[in-house]
């Protein structure tokens, strides 16, 4: 059978080979399509309810004034010329409809690096056969389920026209330090060959890089936090972030009732000052961030270092805040 591709709504003429150019003609067309259950026979003498769909022209050709989805199928003509020689024509008709240009809807203007983001939804309306949607990043195809790319697809069919609407939702996880203005586009590829893809207008969301929170450093003087009774310990909380955050102090996991300050001085250390100290930096944008904890201990005369597992008292002694 000869393959014929016809656009929905357009006319189609199928030639009946070997048919005399004008009546009288001995020919018959047989159709097996979505409009028939088995074979429907149409003859030149016909003319009737089928004329709106298919009718035999004076030259023996079959004329379809406006091809529809239900006209997909097999068309056969059997003709006899004036000398009684029989010729058969056989056609396999497929129909198609090119949709309108696809569009990206609900598109994001900003993406966050390192986390999954919805880029947008690509919509194509009015295709037949359904066809496919695919996404591109900077002109290169994006492969779902690779490198933080995921795609959710949906296909719907119009109850009356039989045409398809396709939807494809793109989620990506942009890499940190990647392109700050990636270009995304979506394209529709028809279900029938020999028709080029249709591409959306591109979108260029900004990629926002959340500033990684640098660690809050707690520096203790003397190093190691072991001091002789009556000595002084200085704790300094170093935070690289700008603007400078508020610094509060904790002892043994309990906030110390002191005004915010990056430096905590413990003069004239006594047993009550022993314990585990840390600082908490509170940023307006990021919330609180705690430093590592350091242990402050008293070295009795003759000891080489901090007492293992020493536990400080609950008193604050005399504190000085720089």
């Amino acid at each position: 059978a000869q393959n014929i591709t016809a656009r929905i709504g357009e006319p189609l003429v199928l030639k009946c080979k070997g048919a005399p150019k004008k009546p009288p003609q001995r020919l018959e067309w047989k159709l097996n399509t979505g409009r028939t259950e088995a074979w429907k026979v149409l003859s030149p003498q016909g003319g009737g309810p089928w004329d709106s769909v298919a009718r035999v022209l004076p030259n023996g050709s079959l004329f379809l004034p406006a091809v529809g989805i239900q006209d997909e199928g097999i068309f056969r003509c059997q003709a006899m010329n004036r000398n009684g020689k029989e010729t058969k024509s056989n056609y396999r008709v497929r129909v198609y409809q090119i949709p309108g240009k696809p569009e990206i809807v609900d598109s994001a203007s900003e993406l966050t690096a390192g986390v999954p983001n919805k880029v947008g939804t690509c919509v194509s309306e009015g295709s037949y056969p359904a066809g496919t949607l695919s996404w591109h990043l900077d002109g290169k195809p994006l492969v779902p389920n690779e490198k933080g790319v995921s795609v959710k697809e949906q296909t719907r069919r119009h109850p009356e026209t039989g045409l398809f609407t396709l939807q494809s939702e793109l989620m990506v996880t942009p890499a940190r330090g990647g392109d700050p203005r990636p270009t995304f586009s979506c394209s529709f590829s028809p279900g029938l060959p020999r028709h080029r893809a249709l591409r959306t207008a591109p979108i260029q969301p900004r990629v926002w890089e959340p500033v990684p929170l640098e660690e809050v450093q707690l520096v203790v003087e003397p190093e190691g936090g072991a001091v002789a009774p009556g000595g002084t310990v200085t704790l300094t909380c170093e935070v690289p972030a700008q603007p400078s955050p508020q610094i509060h102090w904790m002892k043994d996991g309990v906030p110390l009732p002191l005004p915010p300050s990056p430096v905590l001085i413990l003069p004239e250390i006594g047993p009550q000052d022993q314990g585990t100290y840390s600082c908490v930096a509170t940023h307006s944008s990021h919330g609180p961030q705690e430093s590592r904890a350091v242990s402050i201990s008293i070295i009795e005369p003759g000891e080489e270092g901090p007492t293992a597992g020493s536990v400080g008292g609950s008193g604050l002694g005399t504190l000085a805040l720089a």
């Epitope: 028939t36 259950e37 088995a38 009737g48 309810p49 709106s52 769909v53």
Partner: antibody, heavy 119, light 107 residues
């Protein structure tokens, strides 16, 4: 709302002529074939004439061929049936209907108009 | 020409009954058969199109079926409002042909 309203019926003598009209609304007239169907008490429903959406092609049964002419004015969304050489057996209620091809099988009907052929 | 032989010509039934009306086509008309309901003094109303499809607004107790050249209209659990004449029509070939009609009455 789809509406088909027939007019032009009445009492006419055998051999005379009558023209029926059908004004439609509620759908795109020139997208559809249109058909006249009649009903006689004795014979039930009978197809009278069909016309394609452009008006280029018309179809009739042998019983009215060469006597009746179906036509349409797409600009006025109006269907016509010109009936000549009327006979007593043409006495019937005439209905205007939407459809007539295989895609639309008479989904809407007018209220009908009575034609009586009698001397 | 195609003949559509409709039977029965009339039937007297009880409310709640299930009834079937048939039309036999004298030659192949495929799926191109419609069924119409006509109440006294009213225009016909399409009930079933293309042999088996229920027209808009028609109660689901109506159904159409086909077995070869025999087309059937079934009304399950008949209601008083279903009292009417019923007609089949083939619209596959000219001349378009109606069945002779079936009158459905209540006993």
């Amino acid at each position: 709302e789809v509406q088909l309203v027939e007019s032009g019926g009445g009492l006419v003598q055998p051999g005379r002529s009558l023209k029926l009209s059908c004004v439609v609304s509620g759908f795109t007239f020139n997208n559809y074939w249109m058909t006249w169907i009649r009903q006689t008490p004795g014979k039930g429903l009978e197809w009278v004439a069909s016309i394609d959406n452009s008006g280029d092609n018309t179809y009739y049964p042998d019983s009215v061929k060469d006597r009746f002419t179906i036509s349409r004015d797409n600009a006025k969304s109006t269907l016509y049936l010109q009936m000549n050489s009327l006979r007593s057996e043409d006495t019937a209620t005439y209905y205007c209907t939407r459809g007539g091809d295989i895609t639309t099988g008479f989904d809407y009907w007018g209220q009908g108009v009575m034609v009586t052929v009698s001397s | 020409d195609i003949q559509m032989t409709q039977s029965p010509s009339s039937m007297s039934v009880s409310l709640g009954d299930t009834i079937t009306i048939t039309c036999r086509a004298s030659q192949d008309v495929g799926i191109y058969v419609n069924w119409f309901q006509q109440k006294p003094g009213k225009s016909p109303r399409r009930m079933i199109y293309r042999a088996t499809n229920l027209a808009d607004g028609v109660p689901s107790r109506f159904s159409g079926s086909r077995s070869g050249s025999i087309y059937s209209l079934t009304i399950s659990s008949l209601e008083s409002e279903d009292v009417a004449d019923y007609h089949c029509l083939e619209f596959d070939e000219h001349p378009l042909t109606f069945g002779s009609g079936t009158k459905v009455e209540i006993k």
